[in-house]
Amino acid sequence: SAPGEDEECGRVRDFVAKLANNTHQHVFDDLRGSVSLSWVGDSTGVILVLTTFHVPLVIMTFGQSKLYRSEDYGKNFKDITDLINNTFIRTEFGMAIGPENSGKVVLTAEVSGGSRGGRIFRSSDFAKNFVQTDLPFHPLTQMMYSPQNSDYLLALSTENGLWVSKNFGGKWEEIHKAVCLAKWGSDNTIFFTTYANGSCKADLGALELWRTSDLGKSFKTIGVKIYSFGLGGRFLFASVMADKDTTRRIHVSTDQGDTWSMAQLPSVGQEQFYSILAANDDMVFMHVDEPGDTGFGTIFTSDDRGIVYSKSLDRHLYTTTGGETDFTNVTSLRGVYITSVLSEDNSIQTMITFDQGGRWTHLRKPENSECDATAKNKNECSLAIHASYSISQKLNVPMAPLSEPNAVGIVIAHGSVGDAISVMVPDVYISDDGGYSWTKMLEGPHYYTILDSGGIIVAIEHSSRPINVIKFSTDEGQCWQTYTFTRDPIYFTGLASEPGARSMNISIWGFTESFLTSQWVSYTIDFKDILERNCEEKDYTIWLAHSTDPEDYEDGCILGYKEQFLRLRKSSVCQNGRDYVVTKQPSICLCSLEDFLCDFGYYRPENDSKCVEQPELKGHDLEFCLYGREEHLTTNGYRKIPGDKCQGGVNPVREVKDLKKKCTSNFLSPEKQNSKSN
């Protein structure tokens, strides 16, 4: 069973009184429809809440919106609907919050059918004031902020026009027509695809990829025969149609599309897809769908150029229908990812990698749990994690796995213990070491969140009945206390805490229902008095990440270095505080063959760490194309894994081979690219 409230648990003294003094209720005086909540800025305490109520009438939809603002993390709210002239706000566009601490907010309003364009309300002072602006177009998408300059906005119109504003939505200019997809790149660059003939759908695979680096003054065609494109880390990817047939291949650029290389990945047919699962400045995880409606594919990991790919995981679950994958980046520990595979018997199993996709294993069985009915052997089984796929299948899983970069090592997830994911009601499990070991934390499904960089974990039971109890733990989920936050239970709809897990406030959202009325209500609880003092040096202990065998000289080495962290002791009840910075100390490891991947034209035979030359491309889908031309490629067969920092040790030296590979790309080479100016 999971740990609970017993004598063995270190109970927080007088917590009921402390929390009661810091529990704030707010009742929203409007009809219950939908509610959306956004945090404006970081550490500002500003929250915007938009409630909308729809009445579908015969000819039209009547709607009413209300906008509320809090500047104390949700303890008090003020109705500011008059600032947006009591206008009905389109919830499908949400609230477009500006990057960083710009304080910018854009709300898109519903306008009557005959109007020339849409309407937005803009604020640049953390929603204290709003300016109404009528648009010269009807927006199709939410306004997109440039990551570099929050005054620059991008939007697509319902007529496929690409519109740009340079003064935070005050004035708009259409910079291109016939646009299908547009994205901000780095340095205020815009990438977009265009169609020539009928429509985006009709021209799929015959689109052009364009770039503008000056907000639409001039343009450059950087690709043709485009199916789609994507940005990940420093990589720009395009899937390009082949000349000969209906297949397409991935091409990659690391210079904003000036030059392209063909990625050494299998080509895909019409019914298949590529998906960038994760990317950073070092490498990318790419999913390549299997032919047929299998619901799975293969994960490949790239080299530092995004060109050479190593097979990472077979039978990776990724549904074609709903586009669901369980692929999760565990942000609380470097190199860790969790995902699901579809077994031959169609059962779903969870896999974890600790070395950025180098090796995948099952999750270790939690010590305090028994194997369930899915296990063939009652003593040998593993933990199966519920993520997006389980949620999409309407299993009793209220939340996806949770981890936070500043709560080192902590991973919280719903799961079951057996040989495969079970449809039975899951429990909540926690790992304090980034996924190496797990413990059952709570019985049954819960909503959960991390506060104060891991100093507090808060949970609420997932129930169809009204609730009035919140659970919290100050020791990374070992022991739990329960607090009744209201006498009158509410129908719970969500748990909200400021993104980044630095806050000590939690908001419980729900509604009350009586015979005639239904009202939104929020309870905000501040845990500051539970963590009475600031943490000191003595409250932290030293922890080596990725440690599996202290007798191994290189224990803890992942991607060429090991990291020691200062972590809060489980028994310390103190505040990390909003300014808490993770203290870590890296140390470089000696290189081994495992720090290298096999370069183009080489592969690793099963259970061998050496890279051997591939038999002359017989039966291998290996085409190499660099910069759109046939190239000479010199290699010694090994290439350092992206992000690997090892030094010394093994240095794989062998004669440098000159590989001349055929280049079958029909993609534009740089000299054929055209430019134009407005």
């Epitope: 440690s547 090991k562 028994s571």
Partner: antibody, heavy 124, light 106 residues
Framework: QVQLVQSGAEVKKPGSSVKVSCKAS????????ISWVRQAPGQGLEWMGG????????NYAQKFQGRVTITADESTSTAYMELSSLRSEDTAVYYC?????????????????WGQGTTVTVSS | DIQMTQSPSTLSASVGDRVTITCRAS??????LAWYQQKPGKAPKLLIY???SLESGVPSRFSGSGSGTEFTLTISSLQPDDFATYYC????????FGGGTKVEIK
Amino acid sequence: QVQLVQSGAEVKKPGSSVKVSCKASGGTFRNYAISWVRQAPGQGLEWMGGIIPIGGWANYAQKFQGRVTITADESTSTAYMELSSLRSEDTAVYYCARQGRKTGYYYYYGMDVWGQGTTVTVSS
Amino acid sequence: DIQMTQSPSTLSASVGDRVTITCRASQSISSWLAWYQQKPGKAPKLLIYKASSLESGVPSRFSGSGSGTEFTLTISSLQPDDFATYYCQQADGHITFGGGTKVEIK
């Protein structure tokens, strides 16, 4: 089998310093914390502080803060404990001990290997 | 710092007796407790770590239990070699030892 061998007995004058060494053999010295524990005649055990050779992270008991310095030399697999401003009540047997480790936590699993002890006598 | 209170300070027992030593922490230390045996003129020897895990090579007559603030070391059947002083040690805060329990011949 891991062994910790400490330097020989020392006789010191009040106000002076003493530096005791602890050399490890037969194991991966760098991956374990080394603690220093002392025991005054007829008294119990008292933890002074510890060090992790990788990165040289040291931490000290409040009582000895400012008076004790613990260091480690990875190349020779040796840990050192220096105690300054000696007084007669510092007369004790000083032990170095390896902190056992089953996970990434360095100090949580007890001290599984001990040195033979170094007697330090402080007398005028 | 976390204080560790060990009781009794002295315990008289005979060979074959079941012996229990308790240790109380001033605040919860989860399971981060170790037990040691020390004989005169010798270095301490680790018996139990993480409250109840037996160190390899230690006879199974030694067992540990407890979690949070209350811990117990039990010797199921006292042997002649077991007459010594026993210390508990917490590892969750800055390390502290209990005052010791001397097990002597009755």
